[in-house]
């Protein structure tokens, strides 16, 4: 709130309560107990005439305040700017239900500039005014005042003048400033066309059409026309003058873009500095050339910086969990200046003896959320083989990677999946059968899934049906089972163990011991 009042060129002030010398002397109803004229001091110790009311205790408040008569000076639409402070009812204990946080704004058109009384029924409501969230904090000397500013418009007006009125319905409020003004569209040069001073139309939708003329060295796209809107702003809905590509408006003329600048199209924009990592070497450039090693993607606008592929991802961390691997990494140090970065995962299965002999993992491996086009910096890879060397490469790619593929864009890690329990043994054979013993042999499991630590042979008499069994363990792929009963059917199962545990037992092998002391050599799955 200041003493000197500066307003926009398109506003003509009809009333400014801050400019009134001495008391405002507006009419209040009721005369006492309602609106009250109170002086507050501004930062220059000059009194500001305000109107205040704070009747928040009593319900059904109806306090009116009316301005003096305001001439409209031929304006058909006027604007009312109210600066006010409105107290939050929450800061007033015990007034729920009676305290309000709004007031009402009214007007009344009249040719009579000396009406002495407020006749409420003559007034037309403009709006209910509330304190919005966006208040201004204004220094009043060494104090702070929260000022809300609200603007409303009224029209079309037809009589010589009008009165404004403020109705309080139970708020705690101070009107600090009331300003009434109308708008005009001032003389302007816009878009290389000149338009004369023009008075606004009658209502919010009325536009006054004005034809403009192009300045030198510009081309007419369409006939330049502007419309003077009711808010005093020039509008350009159709037609304009434009500088050619490679040229810009400077000092009201269209001049060639300077070296290092460009303009791609015939628009009313100014020449733009060449985007980062690009240059122009002549005046009047319509685009800029990318620096060496930098590129533009097909869908990049001329205004976008030239960019490059990203550097390699950083800090690749692997976490092996049996036959799954979780990979996590950090964004590249250099994204190439682009936002469209994504990541691709390459999986290679490598031989234990020669890690350089790697081949693609194939379709059996699964990636979560996906293998290519990852937007996150982590991936989970499952369905790997146990106890196997894998190399994973994480490639960072962006919209210009295809123009300059570069191995630096990837980071790799080699991991070995954990040992797992071995698969079951496919073939168990009885190599030698006697009255009291059976010699067994078997093959290593198809998938050892680690280092085989030992084999476990479980056997029992067939008619015992596994109710009573014995266990023999051996590191070899064969064993002699002794102490058997003659002429008895035995069932044998074998399983392998790695550090990760036992595999499944083999299919049962049924063998019957001999009655005579000779040896039977067998190599079938079921010796009898």
């Amino acid at each position: 709130v200041t003493g000197s009042r500066v307003y926009p060129a398109n506003e003509v002030t009809l009333l400014d309560s801050r400019s009134v010398q001495g008391e405002l002397g507006w009419i209040a109803s009721p005369l006492e107990g309602g609106w009250e004229e109170v002086s507050i001091m501004d930062e220059k110790n000059t009194p500001i005439r305000t109107y205040q009311v704070c009747n928040v205790m009593e319900p059904s408040q109806n306090n009116w305040l009316r301005t003096d008569w305001i001439t409209r000076e031929g304006a058909q639409r006027v604007y009312i700017e109210i600066k006010f402070t409105l107290r939050d009812c929450n800061s007033l204990p015990g007034v729920m239900g009676t305290c309000k946080e709004t007031f009402n704004l009214y007007y009344y058109e009249s040719d009579n500039d000396k009406e002495r009384f407020i006749r409420e029924n003559q007034f037309v409501k403009i709006d209910t005014i509330a304190a919005d969230e966006s208040f201004t904090q204004v220094d009043i000397g060494d104090r702070i005042m929260k000022l809300n500013t609200e603007i409303r418009d009224v029209g079309p007006l037809s009589k010589k003048g009008f009165y404004l009125a403020f109705q309080d319905v139970g708020a705690c409020i101070a009107l600090v400033s009331v300003r009434v003004f109308y708008k005009k569209c001032p003389l302007t040069v816009r878009n290389l066309a000149q338009f004369p001073d023009t008075i606004t139309g009658a209502d919010t939708s009325s536009l006054v059409e004005v034809r403009g003329s192009c300045v030198n060295n510009s081309e007419e796209k369409d006939v330049p026309k502007m419309y003077c809107g009711a808010d005093g702003e020039w509008l350009v809905p159709i037609g304009n003058c434009l500088c050619n590509a490679g040229h810009e408006e400077r000092s009201g003329e269209c001049q060639a873009c300077k070296i290092g600048y460009y303009k791609a199209l015939s628009t009313d924009a100014t020449c733009a500095k060449c985007p980062p990592h690009s240059y122009s070497v002549w005046e009047g450039a319509t685009s800029c050339t990318c620096d060496r090693g930098f590129f533009r993607a097909d869908n990049d606008a001329a205004s976008m910086p030239c960019t490059r592929p990203p550097s390699a991802p950083l800090n690749l961390i692997s976490n092996v969990n049996e036959t799954s691997v979780n990979l996590e990494w950090s964004s590249p140090q250099n994204t190439g200046g682009r936002q469209d970065i994504s990541y691709n995962v390459v999986c290679k299965k490598c031989g234990a003896g020669d890690p350089s002999k790697c081949r693609p993992c194939g379709s059996g491996v699964h990636y979560t959320p996906q293998q290519n086009g990852l937007k996150t910096t982590k991936v989970s890879i499952t369905d790997l083989l146990a106890h196997t060397n894998y190399t994973f490469e994480i490639w960072a790619v962006n919209g210009v990677s295809k123009y300059n593929p570069n191995p630096d864009q990837s980071v790799s890690v080699t991991v070995t999946t954990n040992q797992a329990a071995p698969s079951s043994i496919a073939l168990v054979q009885a190599k030698e059968v006697t009255r009291y013993s059976v010699a067994l042999a078997w093959l290593e499991p198809d998938r050892p899934n680690g280092v085989i630590l030992e084999y476990e042979v479980k056997y029992y008499e067939k008619d015992q049906n596994e109710r009573s069994y014995r266990i023999v363990r051996t590191a070899a792929r064969n064993t002699d089972i002794k102490g058997l009963n003659p002429l008895t059917s035995y069932v044998f199962h074998v399983r392998a163990r790695t550090a990760a545990g036992y595999g499944d037992f083999s299919e049962p092998l049924e063998v019957t011991t001999n009655t005579v002391p000779s040896r039977i050599i067998g190599d079938g799955a079921n010796s009898t």
Partner: antibody
Framework: QVQLLQSGAEVKKPGASVKVPCKAS????????MSWVRQAPGQGLEWMGW????????TYAQGFTGRFVFSLDTSVSTAYLQISSLKAEDTAVYYC??????????????WGQGTLVTVSS | EIVLTQSPATLSVSPGERATLSCRAS??????PAWYQQKPGQAPRLLIY???TRATGIPDRFSASGSGTDFTLTISRVEPEDFAVYYC????????FGQGTKVEIK
């Protein structure tokens, strides 16, 4: 002339109750809230709360809930402060004061002369 | 709850001198405190409220200023009748008083 008239001094025993009246005159009683303020001997002012004289809705400050009750009789423009289960530490001058509300800040613009309540066995 | 701290506890001044009383809030407040004067055996009297508005009948030698957390009551030229205890009071959903500053004759 706007006035708030309070009753004379009261001497009460611990555990008793006291009801201090505050009679308003010279303005519309229901248009302004009434505050109550306590001042113990040789001490500063303590705001106890206020009552909306229009709705009868009371607001109590911290430490003044439970034993303290604000009430009204608008027919005789009187506000009351009742204190029950009196304790020795309730000994103080109790003031009623009319509340002046404005958008820029509040105050208590008219005060009663105060009622001294002494609690002693 | 906002705590108001007044300083000094006692201020010794001679008649005709300027007296400056301080009131500091424990946290920033959006409003100015009210100021009261209390003489021995009397009820407090409202001096200033709102945007440093003097209450009815208060002479213009009393003025208030400040914002945020630091507020000041100034008596430009102390008169004999001004020797009393002065309290600041913050408004809001809960009101609080400062502990008071006693202005005494030097």
């Amino acid at each position: 002339q706007v006035q708030l008239l309070q009753s004379g001094a009261e001497v009460k025993k611990p555990g008793a109750s006291v009801k201090v009246p505050c009679k308003a005159s010279g303005y519309t009683f229901t248009s302004r809230a009434m505050s109550w303020v306590r001042q113990a001997p040789g001490q500063g002012l303590e705001w106890m709360g206020w009552i909306n004289t229009n709705t009868g809705n009371p607001t109590y400050a911290q430490g003044f809930t439970g034993r303290f009750v604000f009430s009204l009789d608008t027919s005789v423009s009187t506000a009351y402060l009742q204190i029950s289960s009196l304790k020795a530490e309730d000994t103080a001058v109790y003031y009623c004061a009319r509340v002046r509300l404005t958008v820029y800040g509040d105050g208590m613009d008219v005060w009663g002369q105060g009622t001294l309540v002494t609690v002693s066995s | 709850e906002i705590v108001l701290t007044q300083s000094p506890a006692t201020l010794s001044v001679s008649p005709g001198e300027r007296a400056t009383l301080s009131c500091r809030a424990s946290q920033s407040v959006s409003s100015n405190p009210a100021w009261y004067q209390q003489k021995p055996g009397q009820a407090p009297r409202l001096l200033i409220y709102g945007l440093s508005t003097r209450a009815t009948g208060i002479p213009d030698r009393f003025s208030a200023s400040g914002s945020g957390t630091d507020f000041t009551l100034t008596i430009s030229r102390v008169e004999p009748e001004d020797f009393a205890v002065y309290y600041c009071q913050q408004y809001g959903p809960s009101w609080t008083f400062g502990q008071g500053t006693k202005v005494e004759i030097k």
